[in-house]
Interface confidence: medium
């Protein structure tokens, strides 16, 4: 079932829940999701994803129990995860994907939840304990049962069968608004320093909302819509309304590149590179975002906002939504797609417009541009050459640009001063009667992986500084430590002096400042994907693989990583499978991934393992895997007996004979031994790995794996004629580790 970020199912509960066996399988890309709530006035059971971790909260009376999955294992990865929560006889157990994640004692009282079960969200339920819970699920519940009963029947019209395509759509898949009430909500659009919203719009709607972001506490907002076939932007701040129209028609069913840019000084809308903007003096001031960024439609609150402001929007238009699609969506330079949406209504993955919009020649004249990458703007010649007006002082003869730019070199995660040599003037400033303080820099597009920090009062918010500040070492670039080796800043440089000079200097020239990042070796780290506790059965061995621990190193491949087991090598429980009895004090990441290593328990308290991983240059901090050895518990699962004709043979299969153990994520060796003499036949095992035609040999012992592979049989060898059916009592004992269960 598909939940779109605002939907839920309600399932009544007839009685208090004494035992709970809850099984869910879900997938989502959102780090927050409410999966299930069993609700009473005070008692409740809540399962939610929070920061990508599964959290369970069980409140019984005045007691609260919380279970959660480890921080290292994020479940918001769009992959289906299976959750099993059981509460039986005062004990709660949580497992995810077959691994035991947490367990705890709980009060014995039944769970009183007369309000019922809420799946995927809480609807309009107004209970105090719901404050601070996660958002409704945006993703899929592939299965959900409580005590054997499905929670996904019947579905409501808003919760769809199956798992919607949009949840797995990458950000190069268009947002399709199929109307009439389509809407996509994304995380808030922050415009503190500056805000940009970019997308390619294809529509025939002449009147439709495109983007709405509420702000502040006084009803402030930014609103972009199609008004009479053209783009319009409205910014409402406490001190008044700024309204801007663009003259390029967009409601023609053709793709149009749209860009909205706002900062504290101006608002700009650009359609197909044709900009319209407010004057620099229209001080907008910072709009603190509230709620989500709405695209393609409006919710009730946004509609109310707009009607109250009487912007010529009729109620019908307010409720309408875009019919069309948005491609290559980017918010403040970050790509966004359907996967990142917080909620969607009536959306489609991809651009499926009405049939008549797909005429053969509709996109013909766009073919030439189809190979241009969206990031192609850096290839423009920057700055655009300046042609000085006639009659300027001789210093401006042959003048084309004010600065010669040199790359700024910074260490990964380090800082570097922006200096004179990086932005060197091409002319003698004194001769041009210009002072360094009159050369004004403005950061129009920040770097992807760092921040230009300005040690000048008030400048950090304005992102403006002068050439004098550069000389005085007031501007430095701080890199965020990511691995990319190149980056750039876009600077607009203007001159504020009142002396004769080319008008392009008053208007400003745009420069690209390349940033070269010198890589630094990051130390590797050890992570435990399923928590740093491993359970092993006494006197058994357990494979050590990436499901137990892994190395994480952003700049080294597995081939270059080596693990060391710290501590004394004598009696070390880690061994290579092919070298039993020999401690493995050092092993490669490849060996770990190949499953070559085992932990061998030989008795006594289990030895914790402390590891370090090295990339050849740096080693990780030591990390400890706590190991607990538990006594094997063996339980007969099946012992049905066999019926066969005298003189024939019959395989013993798991359906006839199998046992279960308390092993956690461990494939243990289960040995069966015959303890009494057989009267009428013999037990046989097939040799040579069970190859077809391999011989059968009499045996007194076999493993459960042999049974699973069909390599154990009973052969009737009694030649005597009997008037009645004979019964062979096969006396067996089972051994796991050193634990033996007799008289099977």
């Amino acid at each position: 079932a598909s939940f779109f970020g605002e939907n839920h199912l309600e399932v009544p509960v007839a009685t208090a829940l004494t035992d709970i066996d809850l099984q869910l399988q879900f997938s989502t890309s959102q780090p927050e999701a409410l999966l299930l709530l069993a609700a009473g006035p005070a008692d409740h059971l809540l399962l939610q994803l929070y920061s990508g971790r599964l959290q369970v909260r069980l409140v019984l009376g005045q007691e609260e129990l919380r279970l959660q999955t480890p921080a290292e294992t994020l479940l918001s990865d769009s992959i289906p995860h299976t959750v099993v929560l059981t509460v039986v006889e005062g004990w709660a157990t949580l497992s995810v994907d077959g691994f035991l994640n947490a367990s705890s004692a709980v009060p014995g009282a039944p769970l009183e939840v007369p309000y019922g079960l809420f799946v995927g969200g809480t609807g309009t339920l107004g209970l105090p304990y719901l404050r601070g819970t996660s958002r409704p699920l945006r993703g899929c519940l592939h299965a959900a049962t409580l005590n054997g009963r499905s929670l996904l029947r019947p579905l409501t019209p808003d919760v769809h069968e199956g798992c919607a395509e949009e949840f797995s759509a990458s950000d190069d898949v268009a947002l399709g608004f199929s109307g009439p009430h389509s809407l996509a909500a994304f995380p808030a659009w922050g415009t503190q320093d500056e805000g940009t919203l970019e997308f390619t719009l294809t529509t025939q709607s002449r009147q439709a909302p495109l983007a709405f972001q509420a702000g502040g506490r006084r009803g402030d907002f930014i609103y972009v819509d199609i008004f009479e076939g053209h783009l319009r932007a409205v910014v409402e701040k406490g001190q008044g309304t700024v309204l801007l129209h663009n003259s390029v028609p967009v409601a023609d069913g053709q793709p149009h590149e749209v860009s909205v840019h706002i900062n504290a000084h101006r608002l700009e809308i650009s359609v197909d590179q044709y900009p319209t903007h407010t004057s620099n003096r229209g001080v907008l001031s910072y709009l603190e975002p509230r709620g989500s960024l709405l695209l393609g439609g409006l919710d009730a609150e946004a509609s109310r906002h707009l009607q109250e402001h009487r912007l010529g929007l009729t109620p019908e238009a307010t409720n309408a939504s875009l019919l069309g699609c948005m491609e290559d969506l980017s918010v403040n330079g970050q790509r966004r797609g359907l996967r990142e949406a917080l909620l969607t209504r009536n959306m489609a993955a991809g651009c499926r417009l009405e049939e008549e919009e797909y005429e053969d020649d509709a996109y013909g004249h766009y073919e030439a541009f189809s190979t241009l990458a969206p990031e192609a703007w850096p290839a423009m010649e920057l700055p655009e050459p300046c042609v000085p007006e006639p009659g300027l002082p001789p210093v401006f003869a042959n003048f084309t640009q004010l600065l010669t730019i040199s790359p700024l070199v910074v260490a990964e995660g380090g800082t570097a001063w922006l200096e004179w040599r990086h932005v060197q003037p091409t002319l003698d400033l004194m001769e041009a009667e210009l002072r360094k303080s009159q050369v004004l820099f403005s950061v129009t597009r920040g770097a992807r992986h760092g921040e230009l920090e300005l040690d000048i009062p008030g400048a950090q918010a304005r992102k403006m500084f002068t050439l004098l500040d550069v000389v005085n070492r007031k501007a430095r670039f701080i890199h965020d430590g990511s691995e990319d080796t190149s980056d750039q800043l876009v600077l607009e440089v203007s001159v504020t002096a009142r002396v004769p000079m080319p008008s392009c200097l008053r208007r400003g020239q745009t420069y690209l400042l390349p940033i070269q990042v010198n890589p630094v070796n990051d130390p590797p780290h050890i992570i435990f994907p399923h928590g740093s506790l491993m359970v092993i059965l006494e006197h058994t061995q357990k494979p050590l693989g990436p499901e137990v621990f892994q190395a994480y190193d952003p700049d080294s491949a597995c081939e270059g990583l080596t693990f060391q087991v710290l501590g004394t090598s004598s009696g070390l429980p880690v061994e290579r499978r092919d070298q039993p009895g020999e401690p493995a004090t050092e092993f490669s990441c490849r060996e770990l991934e190949a499953g070559s290593l085992v932990y061998v328990h030989r008795g006594g308290p289990a030895q914790d393992l402390t590891f370090r991983v090295s990339d050849g240059l740096q080693a990780s901090p030591p990390a400890t895997l706590k190991v607990v050895a538990i006594r094997p518990a063996i339980q007969i699962h099946r012992s049905t007996g066999l019926r066969l004709a005298q003189g024939s043979a019959m395989p013993i299969l798991p359906a006839n004979l199998s046992v279960e153990t308390n092993a956690v994520g461990q494939d243990v060796s289960v040995l069966f031994r015959v303890t009494g003499a057989l009267q009428f036949g013999e037990l046989q095992k097939q040799g040579a790995g069970g190859v077809e035609g391999a011989e059968w040999w009499a045996t007194q012992a076999f493993h459960q794996r042999d049974v699973e592979q069909g390599r154990v049989r009973y052969l009737s060898t009694d030649p005597q004629h009997h008037a009645y059916d004979t019964v062979e009592n096969l006396a067996l004992e089972v051994q796991v580790g050193q634990e033996i269960l007799s008289n099977l």
């Epitope: 005070a42 409140v59 005045q62 007691e63 609260e64 129990l65 919380r66 959660q68 009060p107 809480t122 309009t124 339920l125 107004g126 209970l127 105090p128 304990y129 719901l130 404050r131 601070g132 819970t133 506490r217």
Partner: antibody
Framework: QVKLQQSGPELVKPGASVKISCKAS????????MNWVKQRPGQGLEWIGR????????NYNGKFKGKATLTADKSSSTAYMQVSSLTSVDSAVYFC??????????????WGQGTTVTVSS | DIELTQSPASLAVSLGQRATISCRAS??????????MHWYQQKPGQPPKLLIY???NLESGVPARFSGSGSRTDFTLTIDPVEADDAATYYC?????????FGGGTKLELK
């Protein structure tokens, strides 16, 4: 019945640290949040932060980050608050208060008697 | 942080009369259909005692002459009729948002 018993008054020198305790009884200590609240003489109440003893999870008022450290010992059902780098403004009565689970994130339904901390040279 | 402003700072009421204390929040403390505002009573040398939770719910063991009302940003605690034992300082507190904050307190005296 629920009872929160706090440690006795403390007279400490400026720059030193103090650790006060709050022993809980009459309820499942590890499964309810414990809040800490400050009250300067003749003044109002200020929330310092809370701890969930079950797993040691803490939430602090930004004003007290780095000043107060909350810990809990499940085995003795005791919550602790350490206040460091003491100055005269840290002279106050400090209360521990249980978070009532039914109202998230928990009204304070039972309070300790308070521990008076006096900072003086 | 959400600021809570209580008024009046102090008030003197005769026995048997009604006392009304107001608390205003700098922003709404409502969510999920509830108002996350609570009232406490504190007597000298004692810890605070919870009287009203979620704006209007009486804590068990608290006399019915205490009542609470209000939503979003404006809340009222009413004591009717006032008894001698009610002389104390009363605090409002919100927990709609961390950090939890308290009002400055209202001191109730008897005439």
């Amino acid at each position: 019945q629920v009872k929160l018993q706090q440690s006795g008054p403390e007279l400490v020198k400026p720059g030193a640290s103090v650790k006060i305790s709050c022993k809980a009884s009459g309820y499942a200590f590890s499964r309810s949040w414990m809040n800490w609240v400050k009250q300067r003489p003749g003044q109002g109440l200020e929330w310092i932060g809370r701890i969930y003893p079950g797993d040691g999870d803490t939430n602090y008022n930004g004003k007290f980050k780095g000043k107060a450290t909350l810990t809990a010992d499940k085995s003795s059902s005791t919550a602790y608050m350490q206040v460091s780098s003491l100055t005269s403004v840290d002279s106050a009565v400090y209360f521990c208060a249980r978070g009532n689970t039914v109202v998230v994130p928990y009204t304070m339904d039972y309070w300790g008697q308070g521990t008076t901390v006096t900072v003086s040279s | 942080d959400i600021e809570l402003t209580q008024s009046p700072a102090s008030l003197a009421v005769s026995l048997g009369q009604r006392a009304t204390i107001s608390c205003r929040a700098s922003e709404s403390v409502d969510s999920y259909g509830n108002s996350f505002m609570h009232w406490y009573q504190q007597k000298p040398g004692q810890p605070p005692k919870l009287l009203i939770y979620l704006a209007s719910n009486l804590e068990s063991g608290v006399p019915a002459r205490f009542s609470g009302s209000g939503s979003r940003t404006d809340f009222t605690l009413t004591i009717d009729p006032v008894e001698a034992d009610d002389a104390a300082t009363y605090y409002c507190q919100q927990n709609n948002e961390d950090p939890l904050t308290f009002g400055g307190g209202t001191k109730l005296e008897l005439k």
